[in-house]
Interface confidence: low
């Protein structure tokens, strides 16, 4: 129903609380270097109008659409062209371009010092003082560096940090209760901030069909007693509560996704008996259990794939008259047996029956043509299968570690004209996989590593679409969305790229490096790591491991000196001369 | 427009070899991954063998592993498999892809094992 006003609608609906997180997520994505003080008081100023609008909803500019409501805000900040540069253009035009426009200018990684945790005693003192203020700190604090957060999230993210605070600040031993908890909530955040950056990476650059697809796969695993029916009318109101966050509009955003719990929990019986436990919670936690919500057991007694899509005289036509209604009922059929496989290997065995469908249903006999098409697409199956076992052996065999040394020699090998910092956080990040996933059941490794390589892989797009250097990293990003991984598995040694000349500052190392925490070492070393494979790109597995262990060990001998900077200045350059032998 | 064309094939008795090559054109060959796969009559398609961009990797199924070579010529855009102590199982259609995808696959090349 159309309202009159719909920012008096939303705050209804939202409540003033919710309301006015929401609108401090919006600010703080889109004006990412204004100071937080400046944020709280638009924030005051536009829930003020909005209690206005409530009142009268006839009261002057309370009939504007929100996102006009908050371009004219931002458009009236008096230091603006100052702070932001040319996002100031976006006010010289008119809704919806304008609003395109703020869009664009939204930074995935904006210049701002890592957002550091203070001591337990500080924390809590600050949240003593007012915690309302505290918290408006950490939802401004996560929207400013991750501008495409799931706002409704957000706030649940906020609401469990609050409530490990006020436990944790009573505690006699504060750290040790509040450590694990803000880990917890910390690594639980940043997966959900890089699945919801791909969702809207799938929507924006790949269009409304391929997320579709992608929450059929996803709903379907999940919910595998629901009609397709069930499962269609669920994505179409999906996708309309993810364009809206992803557009910046989060407060229809989040009031939508209100709506869609509430329907999910009154269609419970049609849908899945697992949301029984969501469905009693309250708002924030509903939705939030929803999404995180274990899949439902399979139903008894499915018939054979092959029935309906290989033996059934029909597909043909059915393909040709309704052929996305076609595709999605065999994707929803395929993924809810198959909850053991990542979206990934769900669409691409979806996007390898289309095109078999495609080339069949023309020619003279299409059923001898497609009879055998499941057994076609078995490799699609076999080739993710063989890689994790491959990659799970070899973390197994090295460890984190020595995981992530391997994944940066691979992946500067591909991709050597990345820069060496991007190259050494995605190796991490890649390694990190290893230990998500490779100890869990043989049934879970292949989804749990296909899901997030996809996470990780499309935070590489992201940023490699701001700053190209790489054809063949541009190619692996735009061609397919489904087809990242396999692509970027399939690149090898970049035989273009002319090899980086030698310069030893690279690998000139000083006493400092021994008393830095252990993680920053392992970086430091594994920069120089990949400045030696820039250097020599086509150097054996020998080779590195005979220089990895130089290093290594000059490392430890000069730690342990007495005089450590005059064994750094000694025995460095004859290091880099060593090493240079080893790779002539 | 991507091209694979395999050939070599032929009717063989156990314990010969053969050669079989796979043309390619239209894309970056030094770029992507190669791949032999194959289909035994009325069975599904069997992963064979993998060859990094540059050649320095390869990867085999356990089934052919010590009997069969995979080789690339970048110069030539030119895949190889070359498959020796042949037994009656290795009788199948072979094709190569592109790296792990189906949709790339050329119209492949028979090998007959038979006495």
């Known amino acids: 129903e159309a309202h009159k006003s719909e920012i008096a609608h939303r705050f209804n609906d939202l409540g003033e609380g919710h309301f006015k997180g929401l609108v401090l997520i919006t600010l703080s994505q889109h004006l990412q270097k204004s100071p937080f003080e400046e944020h709280v008081k638009l924030v005051n100023e536009v829930t003020d109008f909005a209690k206005a609008c409530v009142a009268d909803e006839s009261a002057q500019n309370c009939g504007k659409a929100i996102a006009t409501l908050f371009g004219d805000k931002v458009c009236a900040i008096p230091s603006l062209r100052e702070t932001y540069g040319e996002l100031a253009d976006c006010c010289a035009k008119e809704d919806p371009d304008r609003v395109e426009c703020f869009l664009q200018h939204k930074d995935d990684n904006p210049n701002l010092p890592p957002f550091e945790r203070p001591e337990p005693e500080a924390l809590c003192t600050a949240f003593k003082e007012n915690n309302d203020r505290f918290i408006g700190h950490y939802l401004y604090e996560v929207s400013r560096r991750h501008p495409y957060f799931y706002a409704p999230e957000l706030l649940y993210y906020a609401e469990k940090y609050k409530n490990a605070l006020t436990e944790c600040c009573e505690a006699a031993d504060k750290a040790a209760c509040l450590t694990p908890k803000l880990d917890a909530i910390k690594e639980k955040a940043l997966v959900s901030s890089a699945q919801q950056r791909l969702k809207c990476a799938s929507l924006q650059k790949f269009g409304e069909r391929a997320f579709k697809a992608w929450s059929v796969a996803r709903l379907s695993q999940k919910f595998p007693k629901a009609e397709f029916a069930e499962i269609s009318t669920i994505v179409t109101s999906l996708t309309k509560v993810t364009k809206e966050c992803c557009h910046g509009d989060l407060l229809e955003c989040a009031d939508d996704r209100q709506e869609l719990a509430k329907y999910m929990c009154e269609h419970q019986d049609s849908i899945s008996s697992k949301l029984k436990e969501c469905c009693v919670k309250p708002t924030l936690q509903k939705a939030h259990c929803i999404l995180e919500i274990q899949r439902d057991e399979l139903p008894t007694e499915l018939p054979d794939l092959a029935v309906d899509f290989v033996e059934d005289k029909e597909v043909c036509k059915n393909f040709a008259e309704a052929k996305d209604v076609f595709l999605g009922t065999f994707l929803y059929e395929y993924s809810r047996r198959h909850p053991e496989y990542s979206i990934g290997m769900l669409l691409r065995i979806a996007k390898g029956y289309e095109a078999k469908l495609e080339k069949c249903c023309a020619e003279a006999d299409p059923h001898a043509c497609y009879a055998k098409v499941f057994d076609e697409l078995q490799p699609l199956i076999d080739e993710p299968k063989k890689l994790v076992q491959q990659n799970c052996e070899l973390f197994d065999k090295l460890g984190e570690y020595g995981f992530q040394n391997a994944l940066a020699v691979r992946y500067t090998q591909k991709a050597p004209q990345v820069s060496t910092p991007t190259l050494v956080e995605y190796a991490r990040k890649l390694g990190s996989v290893g230990t998500k996933c490779c100890s869990l059941p043989e049934t879970e490794r292949l989804s749990c590593t296909e899901n997030y390589l996809a996470l990780i892989l499309n935070r590489l797009c992201i940023l490699h679409e701001k700053t190209p250097v790489s054809e063949r990293v541009t190619k692996c990003c735009t061609e397919s969305l489904v087809n990242r991984r396999p692509c970027f598995s399939a690149l090898h040694v970049d035989e273009t790229y002319v090899p980086k000349p030698f310069h030893a500052d690279s690998f000139t190392f000083h006493a400092d490096i021994c008393t830095l925490p252990e993680k920053e070492k392992q970086v430091k070393k594994q920069m120089a790591l990949v400045e030696l494979v820039k250097h020599k790109p086509k150097a054996s597995e020998e080779q590195m491991k005979t220089v990895m262990g130089d290093f290594a060990a000059f490392l430890k001998k000069c730690c342990d000196a007495d005089n450590k900077e005059a064994c750094f200045t000694e025995d460095g350059p004859k290091l880099v001369a060593k090493c240079q032998a080893t790779l002539a | 427009d991507v091209q694979l064309v395999e050939s070599g094939g032929g009717v063989v008795q156990p314990g010969n070899s053969l050669r079989l090559s796979c043309a390619a054109s239209g894309f970056t060959f030094t770029s992507f991954g190669m791949s032999w796969v194959r289909q035994a009559p009325g069975k599904g398609l069997e992963w064979v063998s993998s060859?990094?961009?540059?050649?320095?990797?390869?990867l085999y199924a356990d089934s052919v592993k010590g009997r069969f070579t995979i080789s690339r010529d970048n110069a030539k855009t030119t895949l190889y498999l070359q498959m020796n102590s042949l037994r009656p199982e290795d009788t199948a259609t072979y094709y190569c892809?592109?790296?792990?995808?189906?949709?790339?696959s050329g119209q492949g090349t028979l090998v007959t094992v038979s006495s």
């Open positions: 892809t592109i790296g792990g995808s189906l949709s790339r």
């Open positions: 060859i990094s961009g540059s050649g320095s990797d390869t």
